[in-house]
């Protein structure tokens, strides 16, 4: 048993039929010695008396809020949560496996630049009685500070019969050095509590590996005289690291016809302009990627040819 936060405790249980469970001793936080009784949740049934209560925790029915009283007055509370271990593996029931980039990916994180700011998100089908707490650090043995905000519900979608809820959190490395080579990864730890169940999820990454620039901005077309060609121009996104001479991007320019089946013309360039043939009813799209490190491409910025 360990303390998650004040008056909230996690009991780790092997989740198979004949497992013995965990003996837990609760102590009433009071100078009182006599006349103390214990109850569980809203029940008025007295479970025991005395300053301590010993319970055998085997099931979710043994978890909950234990309260010690004296003469009708509440003295203190202890909330017991369960963390299930099945076949030696901690349960991962609360969050959905996003399966990208690989199986058992519950947390996904992205950064728009090298400032040390990043966003992580996760998915669940649970709509109520759900809380998350996020901690992060650079490295684990001698951790350097990363500050995370509160996790918030950022999107809801319908997936077949189920509703899916996306939560996200923003974190900022306290003493980020954008130009430095990373040697220790960022660690992100999410505590998830659904009713009486506790689970924890972790992710470990280098900022360089989760970079995904915003799309190029101010995408414009300039027709070239007496030609079907146009000059496409764009700018670095505002959120990208500066100076751009050091934090450089490379770009992919694509001409796409109305039909998805039509052949796409693609041009790669390090410049912020390109000359392409603009077909009728086609659109021109541009996306960006770190020039010197193959992390994710940005989403496309698009403009119609006509």
């Amino acid at each position: 048993i360990w303390e998650l936060k004040k008056d909230v405790y996690v009991v780790e249980l092997d989740w198979y039929p004949d497992a013995p469970g965990e003996m837990v001793v609760l102590t009433c936080d009071t100078p009182e010695e006599d006349g103390i009784t214990w109850t569980l949740d809203q029940s008025s049934e007295v479970l025991g008396s005395g300053k301590t209560l010993t319970i055998q925790v085997k099931e979710f029915g043994d978890a909950g809020q234990y309260t010690c009283h004296k003469g009708g007055e509440v003295l203190s509370h202890s909330l017991l949560l369960l963390h299930k271990k099945e076949d030696g593996i901690w349960s991962t029931d609360i969050l959905k496996d996003q399966k990208e980039p690989k199986n058992k990916t519950f947390l996904r994180c992205e950064a728009k630049n090298y400032s040390g700011r990043f966003t992580c998100w996760w998915l669940t089908t649970i709509s109520t009685d759900l809380t998350f707490s996020v901690k992060s650090s650079r490295g684990s043995s001698d951790p350097q500070g990363v500050t995370c905000g509160a996790a918030t519900l950022s999107a809801e979608r319908v997936r077949g019969d189920n509703k899916e809820y996306e939560y996200s959190v923003e974190c900022q490395e306290d003493s980020a050095c954008p130009a430095a080579e990373e040697s220790l990864p960022i660690e992100v730890m999410v505590d998830a509590v659904h009713k009486l169940k506790y689970e924890n999820y972790t992710s470990s990454f280098f900022i360089r590996d989760i970079i995904k620039p915003d799309p190029p901005k101010n995408l414009q077309l300039k027709p070239l005289k007496n030609s079907r060609q146009v000059e496409v121009s764009w700018e670095y996104p505002d959120t990208w690291s500066t100076p751009h001479s050091y934090f450089s991007l490379t770009f992919c320019v694509q001409v796409q016809g109305k039909s998805k089946r039509e052949k796409k013309d693609r041009v790669f360039t390090d410049k912020t302009s390109a000359t392409v043939i603009c077909r009728k009813n086609a659109s021109i799209s541009v996306r960006a990627q770190d020039r010197y490190y193959s992390s994710s491409w940005s989403e496309w910025a698009s403009v119609p040819c006509s």
């Epitope: 989740w15 198979y16 039929p17 004949d18 497992a19 469970g21 085997k58 099931e59 979710f60 029915g61 978890a63 299930k84 099945e86 029931d93 009713k195 009486l196 169940k197």
Partner: nanobody
Amino acid sequence: EVQLVESGGGLVQAGGSLRLSCAASGIIFSDNTMGWFRQAPGKEREFVAAIAGRGSRLNYADSVKGRFTISRDNTKNTVYLQMNSLKPEDTAIYYCAAKPYGRVYYTEGSNYDYWGQGTQVTVSS
């Protein structure tokens, strides 16, 4: 979508046995206390038995103690009710119910969140 599907009911002579099954889908089965309830014609629904998520805690109605056994197989997402020494007064529709993070001493139907459609058990004398 949560589904509880009972099976195994039927007509049996007094003193005989039946085994009811309830297959669950759409829930994290081992997190759920599973209960069996029954309703005889013209009577209130009554609690029969309950089993906690791991199977380590059980509860029975006094009327079935020593005759009925509740069990579960979490690998098959199924709960069972083995009914021996059946009596005519056991005749009823038997319902399976689920309560996430529930307690076995929940004997009120209102404490359970999910219900099956029921299976008929008839004991003839």
